[in-house]
Amino acid sequence: IVGGYNCEENSVPYQVSLNSGYHFCGGSLINEQWVVSAGHCYKSRIQVRLGEHNIEVLEGNEQFINAAKIIRHPQYDRKTLNNDIMLIKLSSRAVINARVSTISLPTAPPATGTKCLISGWGNTASSGADYPDELQCLDAPVLSQAKCEASYPGKITSNMFCVGFLEGGKDSCQGDAGGPVVCNGQLQGVVSWGDGCAQKNKPGVYTKVYNYVKWIKNTIAANS
């Protein structure tokens, strides 16, 4: 997250870290046994880390649970990052408490102008690298689809939307992929891609979770 702030400890209880010996992506806990992340975060072996704030220190609230199933959307397109969404089934149920809890799926698509919370342990530098230990937060508005398409001509599908600031300076970045965009208490987006990070007229692009609610529910039902 570039241009954000240190989240209050465990204030984003649905945020998870995907770990393969290091943090490589974020994710969101949507029920006791399922996490939503980005399709491009797929790895054959993933440990899901819940209740994290400082990912380099054991603070006592963490739950480390291996992935039992990793299901990328069947129409995921590596080239365009269309359908950039993935479900992870945990090998055991998460213990839900004040520091580990679920986030609701959306009941309506994201509305232009809505203020959302984006979070992650990704790069905080728009050029170079500075990866934080503590979870970073960013408040950012949903941009209109017209502005989104104008920023990335020919690259924005109906399964994507933009959140952020056309003036640059505030954005998600490398390491934030798969993480949540939460608007009015609902998981509206999954961190997906962008041209660089926090660049002028290049806002962050996010997977539109609303378009996948049916797929998510059906996949969970078929794999329970």
Partner: antibody
């Protein structure tokens, strides 16, 4: 098991070209990138460049720009490194190595977990 | 480009010794550092990735630490098969760069 198998040793004259192959097996070729690293006799490791096995996107070391070309053939899970206008100081062992793919906003980590056995290229008149 | 400076360039040690090798980056690279072991005539072998994560199959006597610009590889109790050259590599950004190497020799 996961492995990278490289082509055999080559002896070339100055000014010639060499093309080294690196055949991958035991994993999904297009889910990773391939780096090429060389080592001159008695010297350390020098990174030459990287190629995405999925997209073919490349990133070359500046000192080799214009002389090196990296390609992949996904149908045979093989990566290639061609070096042109060879000089005597190109004499080295050339290695291919597997690294993470670079996609979207996931963490970019350029470590190399699997290496080929190396290909000796000797440039001599 | 990010320069990687390794020290010492060589170290003489005995079986059972604790050996520490350091690597300094010319600019911050967070935790994106790898350590490799290379024996004569062989390809490098990954030991440690992301500064402190032990690669599968590597003995636990090898450990890595550090973040930002200063990193350390430690061999807690040197074994006969550990006599080799060790390289650090910044895995943060292109162009990828290696340290000059540290040769661990028998005293």
């Amino acid at each position: 098991q996961v492995q990278l198998v490289q082509s055999g040793a080559e002896v070339k004259k100055p000014g010639a070209s060499v093309k080294v192959s690196c055949k991958a097996s035991g994993y999904t070729f297009t889910s990773y990138g391939i780096s090429w690293v060389r080592q001159a006799p008695g010297q350390g490791l020098e990174w030459m460049g990287w190629i995405s096995a999925y997209s073919g996107d490349t990133n070359y070391a500046q000192k080799l720009q214009g002389r090196v070309t990296m390609t992949t053939d996904t149908s045979t899970s093989t990566a290639y490194m061609e070096l042109r206008s060879l000089r005597s100081d190109d004499t080295a062992v050339y290695y291919c190595a597997r690294g993470d793919e670079v996609v979207g906003k996931m963490t970019y980590y350029y470590g190399m977990d699997v290496w080929g056995q190396g290909t000796t290229v000797t440039v001599s008149s | 480009d990010i320069q990687m400076t390794q020290s010492p360039s060589s170290v003489s040690a005995s079986v059972g010794d604790r050996v520490t090798i350091t690597c300094r980056a010319s600019q911050g690279i967070s935790r994106w550092l790898a350590w490799y072991q290379q024996k004569p005539g062989k390809a490098p072998k990954l030991l440690i990735y992301a500064a402190s994560s032990l690669q599968s199959g590597v003995p636990s006597r090898f450990s890595g630490s550090g973040s930002g610009t200063d990193f350390t590889l430690t061999i807690s109790s040197l074994q006969p098969e550990d006599f080799a050259t060790y390289y650090c590599q910044q895995a943060n950004s292109f162009p990828i760069t290696f340290g000059g190497g540290t040769k661990v020799e028998i005293k």
